[in-house]
Protein backbone atom coordinates (compact mmCIF):
# COMPACT_ATOMS: atom_id res chain seq x y z
CA UNK A 1 0.00 0.00 0.00
CA UNK A 2 0.99 3.65 -0.25
CA UNK A 3 2.55 5.81 2.44
CA UNK A 4 0.17 7.43 4.90
CA UNK A 5 1.46 9.94 7.44
CA UNK A 6 0.03 9.63 10.95
CA UNK A 7 -2.61 11.87 12.44
CA UNK A 8 -1.32 12.79 15.90
CA UNK A 9 -3.30 13.52 19.07
CA UNK A 10 -2.25 14.12 22.67
CA UNK A 11 -4.41 13.43 25.73
CA UNK A 12 -3.76 14.65 29.28
CA UNK A 13 -4.45 12.41 32.27
CA UNK A 14 -8.00 12.28 33.51
CA UNK A 15 -8.99 13.85 36.82
CA UNK A 16 -10.00 10.39 37.98
CA UNK A 17 -6.53 9.02 37.35
CA UNK A 18 -4.84 11.96 39.06
CA UNK A 19 -6.87 11.20 42.18
CA UNK A 20 -5.17 7.81 42.27
CA UNK A 21 -1.72 9.43 42.42
CA UNK A 22 -0.46 8.69 38.93
CA UNK A 23 -0.57 10.58 35.64
CA UNK A 24 -0.57 9.02 32.18
CA UNK A 25 -0.18 11.28 29.15
CA UNK A 26 -1.07 9.57 25.88
CA UNK A 27 0.15 10.34 22.38
CA UNK A 28 -1.95 8.65 19.73
CA UNK A 29 -0.86 8.12 16.14
CA UNK A 30 -3.65 7.07 13.80
CA UNK A 31 -3.77 5.47 10.37
CA UNK A 32 -0.16 5.45 9.22
CA UNK A 33 1.96 3.31 6.93
CA UNK A 34 4.65 1.98 6.94
CA UNK A 35 4.76 0.74 10.52
CA UNK A 36 7.89 2.53 11.68
CA UNK A 37 7.23 5.73 13.57
CA UNK A 38 9.19 7.42 16.33
CA UNK A 39 7.69 9.19 19.33
CA UNK A 40 9.71 11.42 21.61
CA UNK A 41 8.36 12.97 24.77
CA UNK A 42 9.30 16.42 26.02
CA UNK A 43 8.33 17.90 29.34
CA UNK A 44 9.00 21.63 29.63
CA UNK A 45 11.17 21.09 26.54
CA UNK A 46 13.33 18.46 28.27
CA UNK A 47 13.58 15.14 26.44
CA UNK A 48 12.20 12.21 28.44
CA UNK A 49 13.54 8.68 28.24
CA UNK A 50 12.69 5.45 29.96
CA UNK A 51 9.28 6.37 31.33
CA UNK A 52 7.10 5.72 28.29
CA UNK A 53 5.59 2.63 26.73
CA UNK A 54 4.35 2.02 23.21
CA UNK A 55 1.61 -0.20 21.85
CA UNK A 56 1.07 -0.69 18.12
CA UNK A 57 -2.12 -2.12 16.65
CA UNK A 58 -2.00 -4.71 13.91
CA UNK A 59 -2.81 -3.55 10.40
CA UNK A 60 -6.36 -2.35 9.95
CA UNK A 61 -8.25 -4.87 7.85
CA UNK A 62 -9.85 -2.14 5.71
CA UNK A 63 -6.92 0.08 4.78
CA UNK A 64 -3.82 -1.77 6.06
CA UNK A 65 -2.70 1.16 8.21
CA UNK A 66 -1.36 1.06 11.76
CA UNK A 67 -2.12 2.97 14.91
CA UNK A 68 0.19 3.50 17.86
CA UNK A 69 -0.23 4.81 21.36
CA UNK A 70 2.69 6.01 23.44
CA UNK A 71 2.01 6.52 27.13
CA UNK A 72 4.19 8.70 29.35
CA UNK A 73 3.64 7.70 32.98
CA UNK A 74 4.55 9.96 35.89
CA UNK A 75 3.63 10.29 39.51
CA UNK A 76 1.00 12.93 40.19
CA UNK A 77 3.61 14.94 42.09
CA UNK A 78 6.04 14.92 39.16
CA UNK A 79 3.25 15.72 36.72
CA UNK A 80 2.25 18.78 38.71
CA UNK A 81 5.83 20.09 38.80
CA UNK A 82 5.76 20.80 35.09
CA UNK A 83 3.65 22.76 32.66
CA UNK A 84 4.20 21.87 28.98
CA UNK A 85 3.78 18.28 27.80
CA UNK A 86 4.60 17.44 24.19
CA UNK A 87 5.03 14.45 21.95
CA UNK A 88 7.10 14.76 18.79
CA UNK A 89 6.46 12.30 15.99
CA UNK A 90 8.65 11.42 13.03
CA UNK A 91 7.56 9.19 10.15
CA UNK A 92 8.82 8.78 6.61
CA UNK A 93 5.64 10.34 5.22
CA UNK A 94 6.24 13.58 7.15
CA UNK A 95 8.63 16.19 5.79
CA UNK A 96 9.24 17.45 9.33
CA UNK A 97 8.33 16.19 12.81
CA UNK A 98 4.81 16.80 14.07
CA UNK A 99 4.54 18.04 17.65
CA UNK A 100 1.37 18.01 19.71
CA UNK A 101 1.35 19.60 23.15
CA UNK A 102 -0.75 20.95 25.97
CA UNK A 103 -0.23 23.14 28.99
CA UNK A 104 -1.14 21.41 32.21
CA UNK A 105 -4.17 23.01 33.78
CA UNK A 106 -5.32 24.63 30.56
CA UNK A 107 -7.11 21.73 28.89
Amino acid sequence: RTVAAPSVFIFPPSDEQLKSGTASVVCLLNNFYPREAKVQWKVDNALQSGNSQESVTEQDSKDSTYSLSSTLTLSKADYEKHKVYACEVTHQGLSSPVTKSFNRGEC
Epitope: P34, E36, A37, K38, T90, H91, Q92, G93, L94, S95, S96
Partner: nanobody, 120 residues
Amino acid sequence: QVQLQESGGGLVQAGGSLRLSCEATGLTFSGVAMAWFRQAPGKEREFVAIIRWSGSTTYYSDSAKGRFTISRDNAKNTVYLQMNSLKPEDTAVYYCAADPSDRFGEYDYWGRGTQVTVSS
Protein backbone atom coordinates in the same frame (compact mmCIF):
# COMPACT_ATOMS: atom_id res chain seq x y z
CA GLN B 1 29.63 19.09 4.62
CA VAL B 2 26.62 17.20 3.32
CA GLN B 3 25.10 18.36 0.05
CA LEU B 4 22.17 16.99 -1.92
CA GLN B 5 21.98 18.25 -5.49
CA GLU B 6 18.89 17.66 -7.59
CA SER B 7 18.82 17.86 -11.37
CA GLY B 8 16.62 16.84 -14.28
CA GLY B 9 13.68 19.16 -13.81
CA GLY B 10 12.20 21.19 -16.61
CA LEU B 11 9.15 21.96 -18.70
CA VAL B 12 7.27 19.01 -20.18
CA GLN B 13 3.90 18.49 -21.81
CA ALA B 14 1.17 16.52 -20.08
CA GLY B 15 1.66 12.82 -20.70
CA GLY B 16 5.43 13.23 -20.98
CA SER B 17 8.26 11.91 -18.81
CA LEU B 18 11.17 13.27 -16.77
CA ARG B 19 13.92 11.62 -14.77
CA LEU B 20 15.12 13.47 -11.71
CA SER B 21 18.49 12.76 -10.11
CA CYS B 22 19.83 13.59 -6.67
CA GLU B 23 23.52 13.21 -5.93
CA ALA B 24 24.68 13.12 -2.32
CA THR B 25 28.14 14.33 -1.39
CA GLY B 26 29.74 14.33 2.05
CA LEU B 27 27.24 11.72 3.20
CA THR B 28 27.84 8.08 4.01
CA PHE B 29 25.18 6.67 1.71
CA SER B 30 25.09 3.29 3.44
CA GLY B 31 22.21 2.84 5.87
CA VAL B 32 20.48 5.99 4.61
CA ALA B 33 16.96 6.10 3.16
CA MET B 34 16.48 8.61 0.35
CA ALA B 35 13.17 10.31 -0.36
CA TRP B 36 11.56 12.69 -2.81
CA PHE B 37 9.12 15.37 -1.70
CA ARG B 38 7.45 18.11 -3.71
CA GLN B 39 5.96 21.50 -3.01
CA ALA B 40 3.49 23.24 -5.29
CA PRO B 41 2.93 27.00 -4.98
CA GLY B 42 0.85 27.82 -1.93
CA LYS B 43 0.83 24.22 -0.71
CA GLU B 44 2.69 22.27 1.94
CA ARG B 45 5.62 20.08 1.07
CA GLU B 46 4.32 16.56 0.42
CA PHE B 47 5.84 13.12 0.31
CA VAL B 48 6.32 11.49 -3.11
CA ALA B 49 8.48 8.38 -2.72
CA ILE B 50 11.19 6.79 -0.61
CA ILE B 51 13.76 4.06 -1.07
CA ARG B 52 15.49 2.41 1.84
CA TRP B 53 19.18 1.61 1.95
CA SER B 54 18.91 -1.91 0.57
CA GLY B 55 17.04 -0.64 -2.48
CA SER B 56 14.52 -3.46 -2.19
CA THR B 57 12.01 -1.48 -0.13
CA THR B 58 10.21 1.40 -1.81
CA TYR B 59 7.10 3.34 -0.88
CA TYR B 60 5.03 5.85 -2.83
CA SER B 61 2.32 8.41 -2.28
CA ASP B 62 -1.13 7.75 -3.72
CA SER B 63 -0.49 10.29 -6.47
CA ALA B 64 2.88 8.78 -7.46
CA LYS B 65 1.97 5.10 -7.34
CA GLY B 66 1.96 3.48 -10.76
CA ARG B 67 3.42 6.53 -12.54
CA PHE B 68 6.67 7.27 -10.69
CA THR B 69 9.56 4.93 -9.90
CA ILE B 70 12.28 5.62 -7.33
CA SER B 71 15.66 3.90 -7.61
CA ARG B 72 19.17 4.36 -6.32
CA ASP B 73 22.75 3.68 -7.35
CA ASN B 74 24.73 3.29 -4.14
CA ALA B 75 28.03 3.25 -6.03
CA LYS B 76 27.25 6.72 -7.38
CA ASN B 77 25.59 8.05 -4.20
CA THR B 78 22.63 8.98 -6.38
CA VAL B 79 18.87 8.49 -6.17
CA TYR B 80 16.53 8.82 -9.14
CA LEU B 81 12.85 9.54 -9.69
CA GLN B 82 11.48 8.41 -13.04
CA MET B 83 8.21 10.26 -13.64
CA ASN B 84 5.89 9.05 -16.40
CA SER B 85 2.40 10.11 -17.54
CA LEU B 86 2.95 13.53 -16.02
CA LYS B 87 -0.06 15.71 -15.26
CA PRO B 88 -0.38 19.49 -14.77
CA GLU B 89 -1.01 18.82 -11.07
CA ASP B 90 2.52 17.35 -10.81
CA THR B 91 3.89 20.86 -11.30
CA ALA B 92 6.02 21.63 -8.23
CA VAL B 93 9.52 22.02 -6.90
CA TYR B 94 10.88 18.52 -6.23
CA TYR B 95 13.25 18.02 -3.31
CA CYS B 96 15.32 15.04 -2.28
CA ALA B 97 15.93 14.31 1.38
CA ALA B 98 18.15 11.93 3.30
CA ASP B 99 16.96 9.94 6.32
CA PRO B 100 20.05 8.56 8.12
CA SER B 101 17.81 6.47 10.40
CA ASP B 102 16.66 4.59 7.24
CA ARG B 103 13.20 4.11 8.71
CA PHE B 104 11.85 6.89 10.92
CA GLY B 105 11.68 9.91 8.66
CA GLU B 106 14.47 11.81 10.37
CA TYR B 107 15.17 13.96 7.32
CA ASP B 108 18.38 15.64 8.40
CA TYR B 109 19.50 16.73 4.94
CA TRP B 110 17.65 18.39 2.06
CA GLY B 111 18.50 19.51 -1.43
CA ARG B 112 17.55 22.91 -2.80
CA GLY B 113 15.04 21.49 -5.24
CA THR B 114 14.45 21.27 -8.98
CA GLN B 115 11.45 22.81 -10.73
CA VAL B 116 9.09 20.55 -12.68
CA THR B 117 6.45 22.26 -14.81
CA VAL B 118 3.84 20.23 -16.69
CA SER B 119 1.89 22.15 -19.29
CA SER B 120 -1.49 21.10 -20.61
